[in-house]
Amino acid sequence: FNISGCSTKKLLWTYSTRSEEEFVLFCDLPEPQKSHFCHRNRLSPKQVPEHLPFMGSNDLSDVQWYQQPSNGDPLEDIRKSYPHIIQDKCTLHFLTPGVNNSGSYICRPKMIKSPYDVACCVKMILEVKPQTNASCEYSASHKQDLLLGSTGSISCPSLSCQSDAQSPAVTWYKNGKLLSVERSNRIVVDEVYDYHQGTYVCDYTQSDTVSSWTVRAVVQVRTIVGDTKLKPDILDPVEDTLEVELGKPLTISCKARFGFERVFNPVIKWYIKDSDLEWEVSVPEAKSIKSTLKDEIIERNIILEKVTQRDLRRKFVCFVQNSIGNTTQSVQLKEKRG
């Protein structure tokens, strides 16, 4: 199709080489509040273009994204050629940064309902650059945490080194939806709730003498509880003895609950005590079996192919640790009678 009639938007993604960050493109027209509509081509010079829905009730969820190769080749369907780019409804998610993401991206509805809808498309010219200047050493992260129940703020990474007074007007989105009355470079949250979690996008316009473009940054906001003040507790095994059958295989499970920590380095391991000797056992990897805002339950099993007489003289110890401290639980095997 002919893309010359598409509305055009220029975007700049300046990524930090120090951190993982994502980027998004919205299939929208220049004005955010018109994101569900499209100008028809004029039928005659006297007729005013009217707003018509792109997709009727489907609300733009059924759009097609293309990339325009720089060598003039035909448009390429994003889904077929770019595994690091994911389409979610009318949003294109770039999972990894890199200058190779620079280019022209075109979106339009899959269903063209009339010949006048052909110009119902948006062309986004994306320029991707690594951050070069070290002038802003403490720029805001693309991953920001808000502590539940307390006051916090969400900063636009590309503007976090500017004072509020000199900051340009910012357009904010949350999970792809326009936050129409948030326009400063930093959003203050007086009391943090779980619904403040999400993907925030901040846009502002930058211009030079020739043209203007939108500078965009994506911030993943996580709502968290305060770091735990407790060491982990072992939920299983509860008993310190376990009845077993000699010659049979045995799996002993250690389940431990770890309170939330922003920097989370849980340790869960099995070791064996035999008289004065003690050694760690190589066992299958630990796995998280339940995760909530407040805590995580992690399990690690020790597997004995065959219970021997020698195992009855040993103690099997589960050791768990976080930054606060450690806990152990030992199990002595006992032969099942009868």
Partner: antibody
Framework: QVQLVQSGAEVKKPGASVRVSCKAS????????MHWVRQAPGQGLEWMGI????????TYAQKFQGRVTMTRDTSTSTVYMELSSLRSEDTAVYYC????????????????WGQGTTVTVSS | DIRMTQSPSSLSASVGDRVTITCRAS??????LNWYQQKPGKAPKLLIY???SLQSGVPSRFSGSGSGTDFTLTMSSLQPEDFATYYC?????????FGGGTKVEIK
Amino acid sequence: QVQLVQSGAEVKKPGASVRVSCKASGYTFTSYYMHWVRQAPGQGLEWMGIINPRGGYTTYAQKFQGRVTMTRDTSTSTVYMELSSLRSEDTAVYYCAKEGRVSPTDYYGMDVWGQGTTVTVSS
Amino acid sequence: DIRMTQSPSSLSASVGDRVTITCRASQSISSYLNWYQQKPGKAPKLLIYDASSLQSGVPSRFSGSGSGTDFTLTMSSLQPEDFATYYCQQSYSTPLTFGGGTKVEIK
């Protein structure tokens, strides 16, 4: 308890302006957006716009663009809605209504409403 | 703008009846739908938000359902104090828009 108290009834002539106030109490004023909604006699509800009390940022319904101005005074926890170039069709009860969730939020619902201010436009 | 169409515009019912009001959006609004109750001379009162969440203090006989374009408010057993006008409202995008209202009258 959370309360929104609005200014009293107004009678205005066509072409004039009216300013309605809404004083908030019982919560942190800057934490919640404020909406303005009007209701003409015997008619339904019509959303006019929203203000973020923290920065004073506003969004207005297209229908009122150019005629409505929403402002706030954080020192008195009060929001104001001014409507200019009044015409007879602007005769209505005007409500302020607090957004239900702490900002920033996509709009969730208006959980507390003022008692309403009757504005009558008549020559 | 997103148009919200409510039906019926009015209905007559008796105490104890199960009453259902529907609301249709002109485009998909996910679950961004709220329901309000308004009595004559009073301000509206929020009943349901996010299509199906009950606002605190609202009796459990009120329930909401639906997503996308079609939504329903149900009153499982109508009480004398429930005779009022009910409005749906989308909060998907500005301008926020209301349905035309459904007046629930005593039969």
